[in-house]
């Protein structure tokens, strides 16, 4: 089969729940901070429901860094089972964006911010320091990648990943379009290409998840993530068979068997598939 | 002088419900949020409850959230705990304590509560 | 849970200080300058000695002292006299919990 064929493969799960955080900062992004040291830790990622590794610069970031695996997946995962992931950019905002601003019972008066259910916006309000709820964040930024809604309704995306016209290199984007896909695959495909520490100039590929493909990029030989394979069909294999195509109503979906073009129609999370 | 008095505790079945009281007197009640805290035979202090100044907010521990309820009354200078589907490891000396801004600077001399069939 | 870890048992002389440690995670004790430590002798209820991590309440002796290092709050006690024999915890908060740690039981010898 050549890679167009086997490019859209439908597969259906039972969908993830809303996503619940144990604390707030586990919401947070990784921040490695200013400082240049090399650190291993790991945060908990909202997108893919994991903690996972990154490199923490030794000073400042925020609370969403844990110095071992367990202690991240005791603070940020009410349980640890393996399930298939689900992203999608039309996911549900999670629970405790609808819940009211909730000061608590200390008098730390911290600026904090909160998704304010009345205006669609995240606000400023004062934190006691303890207590409160979890629609509670440390920056505005925060708020309204958790919270707010992108053009056209959408959930904002925290992590796509765009190809650079300028200088060819990958660059983590806020990406605040709606996504054309949805991905039931390995956590790590959805991550971006990570060059890794070293100076090495490796020719790897990794999955973009934005665009749904394999793309070549180059390794520095140490470091990086799991998305990161020494071939195309390497990359192919563990990351596509999770990937299918959104669509537009009335839109065309292609599967990896060659059928014919089937007229689908998309509500929401839902696929309706007609004379299948 | 600044006192707070727990009455309520004594011996109840597993599934059986206790209503604690904490009486309040010598500073002003409604500026405080209350909080309650256990401890079990020989064992540390755990967080139970809390509740604000006004009422209008209450907090749980995970280990009571949905079975026990804080409230208060502050016509009355008097703090609740209502609990409800006891459990074994709910026996404790059950504390009412107010909370001056995350620490407990007012303490109760305490209520036992048993949970024993 | 969350959880704030203390040792079991510290022990000193009358007149020596000891000091008693209070680890926890990143989003409780690192998190905030609220650690505050609590005397209880057998049978009574528990005593504020120290609140954001180094003030005293009015009445408290100043023999007693906290400090706070990362994640790592400390209470030390400098001329230890038999009446300091008690049970000592620290506490913190985050948005969930108000949470103590395990308790460490002081033994002046």
């Known amino acids: 089969d050549s890679e167009e064929d086997e490019e859209h493969t439908i597969i259906t799960d039972t969908e993830l729940p809303p996503l619940k955080l144990m604390h707030s900062f586990c919401a947070f992004k990784a921040d490695d901070g200013p400082c240049k040291a090399i650190m291993k830790r790991f945060f908990f990622n909202i997108f893919t429901r994991q903690c996972e590794e990154f490199i923490y610069g030794g000073c400042e970031g925020n609370q969403n860094r844990f110095e071992s695996l367990e202690e991240c997946k005791k603070m940020c995962t009410r349980d640890n089972a393996n399930r298939i992931i689900k992203t999608t950019l039309q996911q549900e905002k999670p629970d405790f964006c609808f819940l009211e601003e909730d000061p608590g019972i200390c008098r730390g008066y911290i600026t904090r911010y909160f998704y304010n259910n009345q205006t669609k916006q995240c606000e400023r309000f004062k934190y006691g320091g303890c207590l409160g709820n979890m629609n509670n964040f440390e920056t505005l930024e925060e708020c309204k990648n958790i919270c707010e809604d992108g053009p056209n309704g959408f959930q904002v995306d925290n992590y796509g990943t765009q190809l650079n016209a300028v200088n060819n290199s990958l660059t983590p984007q806020s990406t605040k379009v709606p996504s054309l896909f949805e991905f039931h695959g390995p956590s790590w495909c959805l991550t971006p290409a990570d060059r890794g520490l070293c100076r090495a100039n490796e020719n790897r590929f990794y999955y973009n998840s934005v665009i749904g493909k394999c793309r070549p990029f180059k390794y520095s030989g140490c470091g990086g993530n799991e998305n990161n394979f020494t071939s195309k069909q390497e990359c192919l294999r563990a990351c596509k068979k999770g990937f299918i195509q959104r669509i537009s109503k009335g839109g065309l979906i292609k599967t990896k068997r060659k059928r014919k073009k089937q007229r689908v129609k998309i509500a929401y999370e839902e696929i309706f598939v007609k004379n299948m | 002088q600044v006192q707070l008095v727990e009455s309520g505790g004594g011996l109840v079945q597993p599934g059986g419900s206790l209503r604690l009281s904490c009486a309040a007197s010598g500073f002003t009640f409604n500026s405080y949020a209350m909080t309650w805290v256990r401890q079990a035979p020989g064992k540390g202090l755990e967080w139970v409850s809390a509740i604000k100044s006004d009422g209008s907010n209450t907090y749980y521990a995970d280990s009571v959230k949905g079975r026990f309820t804080i409230s208060r009354d502050n016509s009355k200078n008097t703090l609740y705990l209502q609990m409800n589907s006891l459990r074994a490891e709910d026996t404790a000396v059950y504390y009412c304590?107010?909370?001056?801004?995350?620490?407990?600077?007012?303490w109760g001399q305490g209520t036992l509560v048993t949970v024993s069939s | 849970d969350i959880a704030l870890t203390q040792p079991a048992s510290v022990s000193g002389s009358p007149g020596q200080s000891i000091t008693i440690s209070c680890t926890g995670t990143?989003?409780?004790?690192?998190?905030?300058?609220?650690v505050s430590w609590y005397q209880q002798h057998p049978g009574k209820a528990p005593k504020l000695m120290i609140y954001?991590?180094?003030s005293r309440p009015s009445g408290v002796s100043n023999r007693f002292s906290g400090s706070k290092s990362g994640n790592t709050a400390s209470l030390t006690i400098s001329g230890l006299q038999a009446e300091d024999e008690a049970d000592y915890y620290c506490q913190s908060y985050d948005l969930n919990n108000l949470v103590f740690g395990g308790g460490t039981k002081l033994t002046v010898l």
């Open positions: 990143s989003s409780d004790l690192g998190g905030f300058n609220t």
């Open positions: 954001s991590v180094s």
């Open positions: 304590a107010r909370n001056d801004s995350g620490w407990f600077d007012v």
